[in-house]
């Protein structure tokens, strides 16, 4: 428990400020699995990496939160970072 959360945080902390902003915008429209809701826009845009990690885990739980984070990273062209995140969660 907690490994996926740490991997999400590590990935988000490695984004530049511009990339973190882009991540949030993509998160607002990323396709979600059935049964999951979207993090409200107002809350999302002001969050730092730590707050965003906690919000992702509380909304989507660790496993799906990590998968969703990896997918948004891929949508941003950060496939290598996405792969590292998923590798860290499957150790």
């Amino acid at each position: 428990m907690g490994r996926a959360r740490d991997a999400i945080l590590d990935a988000l902390e490695n984004l530049t400020a511009e990339e973190l902003a882009a991540f949030k915008l993509k998160l607002l429209s990323v396709p979600l699995r059935e049964g999951y809701g979207r993090i409200p826009r107002g809350a999302l845009l002001s969050m730092d990496a730590l707050d965003l990690t906690d919000k992702l885990v509380s909304f989507y739980l660790e496993t799906y939160g990590a998968e969703l984070t990896a997918n948004v990273l891929r949508d941003m062209g950060l496939q290598e970072m996405a792969g590292q995140l998923q590798a860290a969660t499957h150790q």
């Epitope: 990323v30 396709p31 997918n71 891929r74 949508d75 496939q79 290598e80």
Partner: antibody, heavy 114, light 107 residues
Amino acid sequence: QVQLQQPGTELVKPGASVKLSCRASGWTHWVKQRPGQGLEWIGNINLSNGRTNYNEKFRAMATLTVDKSSSTAYTQLSSLTSEDSAVYYCANSMVPHFFPMDYWGQGTSVTVSS
Amino acid sequence: NIVMTQYPKSMSLSIGERVTLRCKASENVGSYVSWYQQKPEQSPKLLIYGASNRYTGVPDRFTGSGSATDFILTITSVQAEDLADYHCGQSYNYPLTFGAGTKLELK
């Protein structure tokens, strides 16, 4: 429809280099296509922050750069051989999700010949 | 590297036929597959992204499906202007890779 501008043709000698340009934005990919063959991804560059990714197959011969002031992406191809005669496309990823290549330049035809 | 295998290599068909093109990834790529159409002496054009999302302006006779490793592009009633090469590509991992293509020809 966004148009990616690329010069049409380049004729270069074996062993020489060529620098291809593409007016673009966001993530710009470079893709090689030999006559009658499939598509090969060379690499990409993010025009806003200069972040690059390379296909290891092309890392030694391709160098991706960007000029932010003119929104132009470049690829320098060095030590060219006849195997490098191909059409080189630039393409953008502008769709928000799944990172497809949605806008393509018309391609630059590079002929390597003495 | 992820290998994308397309089959068949070519297909001869008549106008109005239903066509199924297949693409197989060597490992799980989720839904990160796109389909491109390329006519002779032209640049590729995006048809489908995210395995099943039709790109802007693409006729609804083109449908994408599949996930993980197996993907299909269906053309419900082929028109003359659809005779072209079709490439699948994955954007799940670097390096991005494409299939060798399927050529649609007139019978």
